[in-house]
């Protein structure tokens, strides 16, 4: 059976704060808990959820969590339902309202030597006390002509006069805490000899050159005085005037007219009245000068056929607020349709080829009145003028592939090749018809291109596939100049590819045929063993039916390949003696000595005094210092081969001789002594 | 012990009603919830709703709403489903079971004219 | 509503060796830490009968050869080991929500 181990209890809360009601269930089977409110179930939300099997509230509300809270459980494997104890929040609130005139009836009728009574609509839960307050001062119960009910929240005056004049307030507090009110209420009892206002001057706008009207009218018993001031404080009057409000007349009513304004006569104006006795009363009211600034350029829009878009007019800055409406073709957009203004929205629903053109904005106020066009294009799905055709390019030429097609506006075209977008560089162009230009045309060019043409409204696309006419070439072109080795095998490659593959063979460029021992093999010409007579120039002719012949040239000669007599050989010497480094090659041509020195060739011709290298190739470094150490590489080299070798030397601190040495003691290393 | 005894099979015209039956014995009718369940042959396993006999509140599916309503009597111990506006699609046998423990021997109804 | 998708829809296996049913939920079954998810074995001309009940809790008279294992939304029923008598229709049913619902079935044979 089911047992709640803990049930929920009732509880006192306070409004807007946390509270939890407490349900713990065990049963056989898996278990459902819910809630119910008044018999209702208890959806969860941010501020009223459950915590496992408790109902945990962010915040309680008097209104949504008044009522009989219950925990239910059900067995989900037996079927049993259970319900604990019932459990009710008692919820401590305050909340503030403001003060109201309870009697008389309204403000209209408060004369003086009638009763008044005020209400504090402030309420809460316990009770609260009330405290009244006028002009911010506490008003304490049982003082002269003045009563506090603190079970009807009223205040009441009797008789009142003049003297109870003011701001009333209230405030009340009780155990969940304390507030005042909301909105105050100004009590004005008059003294017929203080002046009143009877009409007020407004805020006025006008334009340059026109007229502007101030009203100002006050009471009293007897009659009050009416000044009007500007904003410098100069009095302005019918005999008197300010030399920049030649133009004003006061009239016998209070009102002050301004003619022919000007800027500088905007500004604030002062209407004082000065009863017999009280206060004088300053009311204010500002003359503007109406203004309009331009409006912003519109961009041009793009806009798809059948979408809905708008465009927003911002008015320009004015005074007053400029209106705005748009126009089309002359004529004034309505307020709804198709194609309508919404506040300051130009609203194309649905929106068809039709409705390109140019929009007017137009803003309006005192000051004048603005316009701004913008240029709206319906944008159409591009159709075709000349698709991509298969095409056969020839290599090394030149290539055109064209995508040519019309829309609104006009279209993009981007090229693709093997389905890799073509980005334009020094072989690929896009003319600004969609024309895809190949530079010059490579063999690995043949493939699929496909051209795509885009507007907002949509795209096309179309492929081609390209075949590339190979031109007749030697791949590679053999090197003009080449050495053999004297008494060597030796071949000679020569290979070329066309449209069609080409015959090739050899020939001297004398015209004379190949020696025997010399076989043209399938373009490699071959000798058995070079001899010195096989030296000279031959020619690889590569020749097809569709495309000719084509030749190229080659030099041959016959070396002697390098070989060294002398190598350098591992050296230790003193510092300050002298190194030698000895190098001598062999060859055919007859090969040139050149050393490198610590990573960097040693120039002949700028060696200095310490470092010389001999005509048969050997180096010599006198006067020798630690720095010279290193490894050196003599490079022997000719017009057919190079060849190098390299040797370290050491250079080291010449051992100062002990007593028992003999002078005819051997040094502890080899070494080159000079 | 706890057991549900059904009432036995029916064979009903199209449009009628049937009114099937679910006695429970053995334990507190009251408070336990009655559910009630479909099997057509093919078609496996449906959950038409529930019935909390002592309060009387139920639960549907929306797919059986306005095709059965639930009633019980705590005097007789007795749980019934009504189905009305019978066709050939409400053929099959009904199961009433006490949560996921207990269940009927299962009350075949065919629908045929 | 919560869809259960049962697999395999019938399997064959051999005396003494361990079947695997699976059930898996188009949503979360778990509430509160409790998966709600039941498994029910089903003979001909029978009620179904719950075998295990919160995934993995045994139901009342069930040999320990029944398991169930799982949370959130897959969960499997394992025989181990399988005997003549467990021949029978086998159903998953999650009772996390209304309408509570049941798996397509799943028809087991002894090889």
């Known amino acids: 059976a089911i047992v709640f181990i803990k049930q929920p209890s009732s509880q006192d809360a306070l409004q807007g704060r946390r509270a939890l009601l407490r349900c713990e269930v065990e049963a056989p089977g898996p278990v459902h808990v819910y809630w119910l409110l008044d018999g209702a179930p208890v959806q969860d939300t941010e501020r009223r959820f459950a915590q496992g099997s408790s109902l945990s509230f962010a915040a309680v509300d008097r209104l949504q969590d008044s009522g009989t809270f219950q925990c239910v459980a059900r067995d989900d494997v037996t079927g049993e339902e259970a319900r604990s104890a019932n459990a009710s929040f008692n919820i401590k609130w305050i909340e503030a309202g403001p003060v109201v005139l309870k009697h008389p009836a309204s403000e209209a009728e408060i004369q003086p030597q009638t009763q008044v009574t005020l209400r504090c609509h402030i309420d809460g839960h316990p009770r609260p006390t009330y405290q009244w307050f006028r002009d911010g001062t506490p008003l304490s119960d049982g003082q002269s002509n003045h009563t506090v009910s603190s079970k009807e929240r009223n205040l009441t005056l009797r008789p009142a006069g003049p003297e109870h004049s003011g701001l009333y307030s209230c405030c009340a507090h009780s155990a969940f805490g304390q507030a005042c009110s909301s909105q105050n209420f100004t009590l004005s009892i008059a003294d017929e000899s203080f002046a009143r206002v009877v009409l007020a001057p407004q805020d006025v706008v006008v334009a340059r050159y026109e007229e502007a009207m101030f009203h100002c009218q006050f009471s009293a018993q007897p009659p009050p005085s009416l000044q009007w001031l500007f904003e410098d404080e100069t009095p302005i009057t019918n005999r008197s005037r300010p030399p920049h409000l030649r133009r004003a007349t006061v009239f016998a009513n209070g009102s002050l007219l301004l003619t022919q304004v000007r800027p500088r006569n905007a500004g604030i104006y002062r209407c004082i009245g000065q009863g017999q006795r009280g206060p004088p009363i300053i009311l204010e009211a500002t003359l503007h000068l109406a203004e309009i600034e331009d409006m912003p350029l519109f961009e041009p829009r793009v806009f798809t056929a059948g979408s809905e878009e708008r465009v927003t007019c911002l008015p320009p800055k004015g005074l007053p607020e400029p209106s705005v409406w748009w126009e089309h073709a002359g004529v004034r957009l309505p307020t709804h349709g198709r194609v309508y203004q919404k506040g300051h929205e130009l609203v194309l629903a649905n929106i068809a080829e039709s409705d390109a053109g140019v929009y007017t904005c137009h803003a309006a106020n005192l000051a004048g009145q603005r316009r701004q066009d913008v240029n709206i294009t319906v944008a159409t799905v591009p159709s075709w003028l000349k698709k991509p055709q298969d095409s056969q390019l020839e290599e090394g030429k030149p290539g055109y592939l064209d995508c040519l097609t019309q829309a609104t506006p006009k279209p993009t075209v981007v090229w693709y090749r093997n389905q890799m977008l073509i980005s334009e560089d020094s072989r690929f162009e896009v003319f600004k018809n969609g024309t895809l230009r190949i530079n010059s045309v490579e063999v690995y060019d043949g493939t699929w291109y496909r051209c795509m043409s885009s507007t907002p409204a949509g795209s096309i696309e179309a492929q081609a596939r390209v075949q590339v006419l190979e031109k007749l070439k030697f791949t590679p072109p053999p090197q003009p100049q080449q050495c053999m080795e004297f008494d060597k095998e030796a071949t000679v490659p020569c290979s070329a590819t066309g449209r069609e593959k080409p015959t090739i063979k050899w020939e001297r460029a004398d015209g004379s045929s190949l020696p025997e021992w010399v076989t043209d093999n399938a373009g490699t010409l071959h000798f058995a063993r070079v001899t010195r007579d096989d030296a000279g120039n031959y020619t690889c002719i590569a020749s097809n039916g569709p495309q000719g012949q084509i030749r190229a040239h080659v030099q041959l000669t016959v070396a002697v390949f390098i070989t060294f007599k002398v190598e350098p050989e591992r050296t230790t010497v003193y510092q300050g003696h002298t190194a030698l480094l000895q190098c001598e090659a062999q060859g055919d041509p007859k090969p040139l000595i050149q050393w490198k020195g610590k990573d960097r060739i040693l120039d002949p011709t700028k060696l200095g005094p310490r470092m010389h290298i001999f005509q048969n190739g050997s180096l010599v470094i006198h006067d020798v210092a630690p720095e010279d150490s290193g490894r050196y590489t003599c490079i022997a080299g000719n017009s057919c081969n190079i060849k190098h070798t390299e040797a370290p030397l050491y250079v080291v601190d010449k051992p100062v001789p002990e007593e028992s040495e003999g002078p005819g003691s051997p040094p502890p290393y080899k070494m080159i002594q000079t | 012990q706890v057991q549900l005894q059904q009432s036995g099979a029916e064979l009903m015209k199209p449009g009628a009603s049937v009114k099937i039956s679910c006695k429970a014995t053995?334990?507190?009718?009251?408070?336990?919830?009655i559910e009630w369940v479909k099997q057509r042959p093919g078609h496996g396993l449906e959950w038409i709703g529930e019935?909390?006999?002592?309060?009387?509140?139920?639960n549907y599916n929306e797919k059986f709403k306005g095709k059965a309503t639930f009633t019980a009597d705590t005097s007789s111990n007795t749980a019934y489903m009504q189905l009305s506006s019978l066709t050939s699609e409400d053929s099959a046998v009904y199961y009433c079971?006490?949560?996921?423990?207990?269940w009927g021997q299962g009350t075949t109804l065919t629908v045929s004219s | 509503d919560i869809v259960l998708t049962q697999s395999p829809a019938s399997l064959a296996v051999s005396l003494g060796q361990r079947a695997t049913i699976s059930c898996r939920a188009s949503?979360?079954?778990?509430?509160?830490?409790?998966?709600?998810m039941h498994w029910f074995q089903q003979k001909p001309g029978q009620p179904p009968k719950l075998l295990i009940y919160?995934?993995?809790n045994l139901g009342s008279g069930v040999p320990a050869r029944f398991s169930g294992s799982g949370s959130g939304t897959d969960f499997s029923l394992n025989i181990h080991p399988l005997e003549e008598a467990d021949t029978a229709m086998y159903f998953c049913?999650?009772?996390?929500?209304?309408?509570?619902?049941f798996g397509g079935g799943t028809k087991l044979e002894i090889k």
């Open positions: 049913q999650q009772s996390k929500e209304v309408p509570r619902t």
């Open positions: 019935i909390l006999p002592g309060r009387g509140s139920t």
């Open positions: 949503e979360s079954v778990d509430n509160y830490g409790i998966s709600f």
């Open positions: 053995g334990y507190t009718f009251s408070n336990y919830w």
């Open positions: 079971a006490r949560g996921k423990q207990y």
């Open positions: 919160a995934a993995s």
